[in-house]
């Protein structure tokens, strides 16, 4: 069905009109405007940008644009007492100190308020001790150290390379291992692509470049002092000792020049295998401590950052729906950056700005979407998804009743190779159909569809002729909408070739070198990839807001549920004897999935046949589609993670960025062979199978005929 049927307007106001209005040149202009000074959360500069965006969205034609403010816990370095790491000799003299700031990029030497590299929410402290190299500080790395190598990290300062998993998980793992401090560094193996020059001559990380970032383990809580509730004027705040997710040991990030000085002296054990070696000219010995002549030297951290309750500002724009104003399609991305935000977030914010402009242009010509579209410029994403989470907490009752979909809009690019999409299975068909209608921006695919280049470059591992679409994890502002509230969500951006580029993220991520010039010179000079991302994100919002029948296909959920059930069953079957001993059966889950599949199939048949001119029946069918994602929410949440309530998906307990399927069962099975009470452990597996089976069955029943 063409989208313009939603409202009785002239056919020129269809998806094509919206897409044709999007211009690469505008995105470029907006990106430049958003990246000239830092916009750190909680600063005056970011407040001014919020007001600018509010003003411009009003000019673009939105019905209303409001600022929503909250007072949340943020973290900043001490301006007069900088953070650094030293090597000290036996007399306590500092014989080496890490750098206090990144050398500024050309043209930015006189910019003030560049926050030096720091790990947000690190406690203060000056621990000193022997160093242990812990690879990526993943769960499996600590297993290797503790169980295989019998190396004890207790009382040690650990040094871990960035990459593979969210930095907060690294810090949590180090804490659990008994470490008294954590040094994070960027290894060239992960942040320096072969054959590319360092910034400013290329897009690689120079030796003095450092990745900033928060090190929280919030598990979806939002502001650490007001979990579950908005940090408003009358909020009751927890004491800092009861705050959610704060690290308990000092943490600090460094670049690879400084890391070289620490790692080159390492003694103790050799690295266990090649996967522990990076690209520096050092032995990558694990330690503990330094070798030979340096064995009396220690490492000392000097961390003086402070946590402060600070005001943040979201910008919320509304384009009222003509037919179903009480149904919300949300497009949101953050505005706050660590420094200039050339990619993260402003490549995304510039795209949102252009999407708002295009929708506003159509609205000025008399068009309205069928459903209400909300646009959001979130604050304090970098400090733990705080702006989006506080707003969703404040509006949770409206959102759970009215929220149709949430489309995320952080960085538009992390490479320029092909499209990358993570979304709910409900959106698979929407994404497929949309990308078949869009032109590919890729070289060698002139005149071909985006779907074709995407499928060629990033094929689905399961279905030939289809592109890969990944599970939603976290680490971005969709988290509260999807994982807590159960609102169908999706995200899209242009990415690198994961097969040839093994580095983690993009090299200059969260460094001072993430500038406008980085994007304009090296990633997307013509802004054609930005435009394509704008078309995908905007096109998804357009269809979700304007199609008569919601563009969700519940049959795709049935397919993945079977895949996830097979996967978790095969993990459990690695313990056949215990499954027999403790009578562990997956029959209930497979039965529920089978029922879901049958009911989804029948629902889809009814969806083809019902009378779409009957507004009551139309609304009823659409509500069943809208509330399907909601049906996967367990009000009690996952064990020890009350704000992760989706039974089918949650961020991995070992990597916030990654999504895990049937997370309750997965976590119950994880490392089960090491549990001291096997009977209790397998009992929890059985309970989680029960919860999953019940939830799938209950969700299936929401798709049954209502009477």
């Amino acid at each position: 069905k063409s989208s313009n049927e939603a409202t009785n307007i002239t056919p020129k106001h269809n998806m094509k009109a919206f897409l044709d209005e999007l211009k690469a040149e505008n995105i470029k202009k907006f990106l430049y405007n958003f990246t000239q000074i830092p916009h750190l959360a909680g600063t005056e500069q970011n407040f001014q940008l919020a007001k600018q965006i509010q003003s411009q969205w009003k000019e673009f034609g939105l019905d209303s644009v409001e600022l929503a403010h909250y007072d949340v816990l943020l973290s900043y370095p001490n301006k007069t007492h900088p953070n650094y790491i030293s090597i000290i000799n036996e007399d306590g003299n500092e014989i080496f100190n890490t750098s206090l700031f990144e050398p500024p990029p050309p043209g930015y030497e006189n910019v003030s308020d560049i926050v030096p590299p720091f790990s947000a929410f690190s406690p203060q402290g000056m621990p000193e001790g022997d160093l242990v190299y812990v690879n990526y500080a993943r769960t499996e790395d600590f297993f290797k150290l503790e169980r295989d190598m019998k190396i004890n990290c207790s009382g040690k300062i650990v040094i871990a390379r960035y990459g593979k998993v969210f930095r907060g998980n690294k810090v949590k793992n180090a804490q659990l291992a008994g470490a008294k401090g954590v040094i994070l560094y960027s290894d060239p193996a992960d942040y320096f692509a072969p054959g590319v020059k360092s910034y400013p001559d290329g897009w690689n990380l120079p030796g003095g470049g450092v990745q900033r970032g928060n090190i929280l383990n919030l598990n979806g809580a939002g502001d650490p002092l007001t979990p579950g509730y908005p940090a408003n004027e009358y909020a009751y705040r927890r004491g800092i000792a009861e705050a959610v997710g704060l690290p308990s040991i000092p943490v600090h990030p460094i670049g690879y020049y400084d890391a070289q000085k620490l790692l080159e002296k390492m003694g103790g054990s050799a690295p266990p295998d090649s996967s522990w070696r990076g690209s520096l000219k050092v032995p990558y010995n694990v330690g503990p401590g330094f070798t030979g002549n340096f064995s009396t030297q220690k490492v000392k951290m000097h961390i003086h950052s402070t946590n402060e309750v600070t005001r943040i500002y979201n910008v919320i724009g509304t384009l009222r729906g003509a037919v179903e104003p009480d149904r919300y399609v949300i497009l949101g991305g953050h505005r706050d950056s660590w420094v200039f935000g050339g990619i993260d977030p402003q490549s995304g914010a510039a795209v949102v700005h252009e999407i708002v402009r295009s929708f506003g242009t159509l609205k000025k010509e008399g068009w309205r979407p069928r459903r209400t579209i909300l646009f959001a410029s979130w604050d304090a994403e970098e400090f733990g998804l705080l702006g989006s989470t506080e707003w969703a907490e404040e509006n949770s009752r409206l959102l759970q009743e009215r929220g149709v979909a949430y489309i995320n809009a952080d960085s538009s690019i992390e490479g320029n190779y092909t499209l990358r999409v993570d979304c709910t299975p409900l959106m698979y068909s929407l994404v497929h159909n949309l990308t078949k209608e869009l032109k590919s921006p890729d070289e060698g695919f002139e005149g071909k569809s985006l779907y074709e280049s995407w499928t060629k470059k990033s094929p689905s591992p399961e279905f030939s002729g289809m592109p890969r679409i990944s599970k939603l994890g976290s680490g971005n502002d969709f988290e509260v909408f999807f994982q807590r509230l159960g609102i169908a969500s999706g995200r899209a951006r242009y990415t690198k070739n994961w097969e040839t580029n093994k580095f983690s993220g993009y090299p200059l991520y969260h460094s001072v070198y993430e500038t406008y010039e980085l994007v304009e010179k090296f990633y997307d000079p013509m802004f054609k990839y930005h435009l394509t991302v704008a078309q995908v994100r905007g096109g998804m919002v357009f269809e979700l807001a304007n199609s008569i029948v919601l563009p969700f296909d519940c049959r795709d959920y049935a397919v993945v549920l079977r895949k996830y059930a097979d996967k978790i069953y095969s993990i459990s079957m690695k313990h056949p004897q215990e499954m027999k001993t403790y009578s562990v059966s997956f029959d209930s889950l497979f039965s529920a999935v089978k029922n879901f599949t049958e009911i989804a199939s029948k629902f889809s048949e009814r969806l083809q046949d019902f009378d779409k001119s009957n507004p009551i029946v139309l609304r009823m069918m659409n509500d069943q589609l809208m509330f399907l994602e909601r049906a996967f929410i367990d009000p009690l949440g996952l064990p020890d993670r009350p704000f992760y309530r989706h039974v089918i998906y949650a961020p991995s307990s070992h990597n916030k960025y990654a999504g895990e399927s049937f997370p309750g069962i997965y976590d119950a099975l994880f490392d089960i062979e090491s549990k001291v009470d096997p009977s209790k452990a397998w009992g929890e597996v059985k309970r989680q199978i029960y919860v999953a089976a019940f939830t799938v069955q209950a969700a299936a029943e929401t798709l049954s005929e209502v009477a």
């Epitope: 169980r147 019998k150 003694g267 054990s269 050799a270 266990p272 295998d273 090649s274 030979g292 062979e673």
Partner: antibody, heavy 115, light 107 residues
């Protein structure tokens, strides 16, 4: 109880290859490094290389100049060591050992290289 | 490569007496040294790891000590079942290397 059971003795001609298997049980296979060590008759021990069964990361003794390949099959908790371009001085007992500190050893596999 | 030099080549000690085995590394290896026992026609067995920690089930008459370049394995009261060849090994740098072994016999 941790057990490492190796494949049986082999007699090979010079220039041939040999592949020795090491089937493990009694522990989580992916958690422990697997090393391969050989011992020529009446001689000391010589480390050949190792593998991390979790991710396949390997390190080899450069003395073997690319002649040795260590692999694992996670589905059967089995490690393999293949030595190519055999010569008479490769005649030895070949051991697998589990654990970074060579905590548990297989019973050994005698490989005889003779024309 | 790091060379591990063991001394003596062989050692004859009376039952119940102390046996002291030495191992010297050609460069500093910290405490990254393990000791193994190999009885005739058997596989080696881990005795001591990280220079001084006894492996599970190893009798407390076996003690490891040392750091840097000089390491010692002491059997405080030799038993008949301790007759074997003892190897030291460094795990500080690749390739991992073993000493030539010390043969312990009953006097």
């Amino acid at each position: 109880e941790v057990q490492l059971v190796q494949s049986g003795a082999e007699v090979k001609k010079p220039g041939a290859s040999v592949k020795v298997s090491c089937k493990t049980s009694g522990y989580t296979f992916t958690e422990y490094t697997i090393h391969w060590v050989r011992q020529a008759p009446g001689q000391s021990l010589e480390w050949m290389g190792n593998i991390n069964p979790n991710n396949g990361g390997t390190t080899y003794n450069q003395k073997f100049q690319g002649r040795v390949t260590i692999t694992v099959d996670k589905s059967t908790s089995t490690a393999y060591m293949e030595l190519s371009s055999l010569r008479s001085e490769d005649t030895a007992v070949y051991y697998c050992a589990a654990g970074w500190n060579f905590d548990y050893w297989g019973q050994g596999t005698l490989v005889t290289v003779s024309s | 490569d790091i060379v591990m030099t063991q001394s003596p080549d062989s050692l004859a000690v009376s039952l119940g007496e102390r046996a002291t085995l030495s191992c010297r590394a050609s460069q500093d290896v910290g405490t990254a040294v393990d000791w193994y026992q190999q009885k005739p026609d058997q596989s080696p067995k881990l005795l001591i790891y990280w220079a001084s920690t006894r492996h599970t089930g190893v009798p407390d008459r076996f003690t490891g000590s040392g750091s840097g370049t000089d390491f010692t394995l002491t059997i405080s009261s030799l038993q008949a079942e301790d007759v074997a060849v003892y190897f030291c090994q460094q795990l500080n740098s690749y390739p991992l290397t073993f000493g030539a072994g010390t043969k312990v016999e009953i006097k």
